[in-house]
């Protein structure tokens, strides 16, 4: 049965408006490839409506299919020799609960300095998303160059 | 209080369906790095439902959080060309009103000929979005290679 | 007249929740540049809610404006490989019915090994979307590296 038929009498709130757009706060300590995010109007144009931050990682509050998107720009590009820094890779995944751990989206910086992508994926309440940046180059903290967000799309 | 609880008695129209997808019309004159856009069924698959064009720039008609996306492909380009003409950079931002001027999204063409990205951002009625392409290379006007759009996501 | 005013008395189901996220199944035989997709919970995190697969190609079931997104990563690839096998190009388009055949989105792998983009486009019930990968390099079948999806956005 299609969702909306069963749900059509419920208030609009039940459809979910969960959405978040985050900016980079800092990188992780040794042996921790995760990027740590922050969000909120005081910080600029980032926000959280529904999802929450848990120690810099994004935690989902509503089950559903989400559009997850990310852009990360390196603060300095790899040289044309590229192999000097290769591989620098970004992966977005569910990192907790451990039973649901999975990589959702993965990209490598080859001779470019920015990766950007998006995908649809089912997420459940309590899923925490982690963004792992592996390599020796630093990410830019400029808010128009590095950002990460999710948008609830449907149940 | 979550938005939709307060809004649940309003007609669906109040949720907003504002959306636009534009194709490149032309580049600016000297000293004007802006790309000028066009949209409408007569032109192909571009359209404006809510937002409007003001001298080739996209003006927002409804407050809310929007998904902004763009793809720009350089016209006569190979990885060698791209690196030789480096830096070529694309920035999407609010250019008016001046009090709200800010860069929302920025990407450089390094050794590639196409950039594509997307982000969530709050926009207000009257905000005009500009897309600035700096560098000496020209963008392709093919409608499957260069396009720019917004989609209203939530209040 | 704005859509939602006319539609506001209809059940929410009429707004459409059509969405799909697919993973790569296989490439085509010789002379067939199409990628063949698969989806469903048994396969992992891919799914079809509304659209259907027709011999590995995505068929639309509901008229409307859709957000189409794709990421394709080449399997055995470095920036040197990518440039040596140039041009490798990905195009997403309507391939049937023939009367509506058109390229919607096109990207080249220059010195990169991944392309990712998205766009808004009107699609009609019965439109079949094809993704053509031209060149000699094979796409990765990792579900976090290569995926293709659509999301209904508005009528």
């Amino acid at each position: 049965q299609r969702f909306a038929q069963a749900q059509q009498q419920l208030p609009l709130e039940s459809l979910g408006w969960d959405v978040a757009e985050l900016q980079l706060n800092h990188t992780g300590p040794q042996q921790d490839p995760r990027l740590y995010w922050q969000g909120g109007p005081a910080l600029g144009r980032s926000f959280l409506h529904g999802p929450e931050l848990d120690k810099g990682q994004l935690r989902i509050h509503r089950d559903g299919i989400y559009m997850v998107h990310i852009q990360v720009t390196l603060a300095i590009c790899s040289s044309t020799t590229a192999s000097r820094h290769h591989p620098t890779t970004l992966a977005v995944g569910i990192c907790s609960p451990a039973s649901r751990s999975i990589s959702l989206l993965r990209l490598s910086f080859h001779q470019g300095c920015t990766i950007a992508s998006q995908r649809l994926t089912p997420l459940a309440r309590g899923d925490t998303l982690c963004t792992n940046l592996t390599g020796t180059l630093l990410p830019s903290r400029n808010t128009d160059e590095t950002f990460f967000g999710v948008q609830w799309v449907r149940p | 209080q979550r938005f939709a609880q307060a809004q649940q008695q309003l007609p669906l129209e109040s949720l907003g369906w504002d959306v636009a997808e534009l194709q490149l019309n032309h580049t600016g004159p000297q000293q004007d790095p802006r790309l000028y856009w066009q949209g409408g069924p007569a032109l192909g698959r571009s359209f404006l439902h809510g937002p409007e064009l003001d001298k080739g720039q996209l003006r927002i008609h409804r407050d809310g959080i929007y998904m902004v996306h763009i793809q720009v492909t350089l016209a006569i380009c190979s990885s060698t060309t791209a690196s030789r003409h480096h830096p070529t950079t694309l920035a999407v931002g609010i250019c008016s009103p001046a009090s709200r001027s800010i860069s929302l999204l920025r990407l450089s063409f390094h050794q590639g000929c196409t950039i594509a990205s997307q982000r969530l951002t709050p926009l207000a009625r009257g905000d005009t979005l500009c897309t600035n392409l700096t560098g000496t290379l020209l963008p392709s006007r093919n409608t499957d290679e260069t396009f720019f759009g917004v989609q209203w996501v939530r209040p | 007249q704005r859509f939602a005013q006319a539609q506001q008395q209809l059940p929410l189901e009429s707004l459409g929740w059509d969405v799909a996220e697919l993973q790569l199944n296989h490439t085509g035989p010789q002379q067939d540049p199409r990628l063949y997709w698969q989806g469903g919970p048994a396969l992992g995190r891919s799914f079809l809610h509304g659209p259907e697969l027709d011999k590995g190609q995505l068929r639309i079931h509901r008229d409307g404006i859709y957000m189409v997104h794709i990421q394709v990563t080449l399997a055995i690839c470095s920036s040197t490989t990518a440039s040596r096998h140039h041009p490798t190009t990905l195009a997403v388009g309507i391939c049937s019915p023939a009367s509506r055949s058109i390229s919607l989105l096109r990207l080249s792998f220059h010195q990169g090994c991944t392309i990712a983009s998205q766009r808004l486009t009107p699609l009609a019930r019965g439109d079949t979307l094809c993704t053509n990968l031209t060149g000699t390099l094979l796409p990765s079948r990792n579900t976090d590296e290569t995926f293709f999806g659509v999301q209904w956005v508005r009528p």
């Epitope: 800092h26 040794q30 300095i76 590009c77 790899s78 630093l138 | 030789r84 830096p87 450089s108 390094h110 | -």
Partner: antibody, heavy 120, light 108 residues
Framework: EVQLLESGGGLVQPGGSLRLSCAAS????????MSWVRQAPGKGLEWVSV????????DYADSVKGRFTISRDNSKNTLYLQMNSLRAEDTAVYYC?????????????WGQGTLVTVSS | EIVLTQSPGTLSLSPGERATLSCRAS???????LAWYQQKPGQAPRLFIY???SRATGIPDRFSGSGSGTDFTLTISRLEPEDFAVYFC?????????FGQGTKLEIK
Amino acid sequence: EVQLLESGGGLVQPGGSLRLSCAASGFTFSSYAMSWVRQAPGKGLEWVSVISDSGGTTDYADSVKGRFTISRDNSKNTLYLQMNSLRAEDTAVYYCARHDYSNRYYFDYWGQGTLVTVSS
Amino acid sequence: EIVLTQSPGTLSLSPGERATLSCRASQSFSSNYLAWYQQKPGQAPRLFIYGASSRATGIPDRFSGSGSGTDFTLTISRLEPEDFAVYFCQQYGISPCSFGQGTKLEIK
């Protein structure tokens, strides 16, 4: 006021080791990437190594890779450079420098430097 | 590695004159990521210009930076006695970041 104070320089024989320190004050040390930059006597500047704000990411110039190790202790507001297998060509004034907040690789504050002399 | 060549090696001018210092890169790099530093004898370098043309905090407006691609210029519109020093350019667009060999600005 932002202050960076290097120490630990001195005379060392080729093949020897030295550990430089940089004490930071006047800013939130844990929020900034830091680098070491050196300057041979009468010469130009050469970037040596970088470490991210929390210390998880490091990078080195090819000339020192495998011999030098950068680290930091955010609880002590201190940056370190462990230099092993020193060579005559490592002789220089070593500066610690703070990256711009965006993480871009330009340096908005520098220490006064500490001289390292590698000679037999 | 990108090589930055500064010219002239030494520039002899008098206070009140205009100084033009050049920095040329062996290849172009990202988004005009070029900085200029001033260094006086026995002192650490001090950031003057970043992003090719943005003045750092506290730098007087007689200093201006320009250029793009491979050719960059630092201009001092009217020299003051405290401006005589060595000036280094630095590119931070492509790893590893690199510096020019410096231009010595001396009193004529």
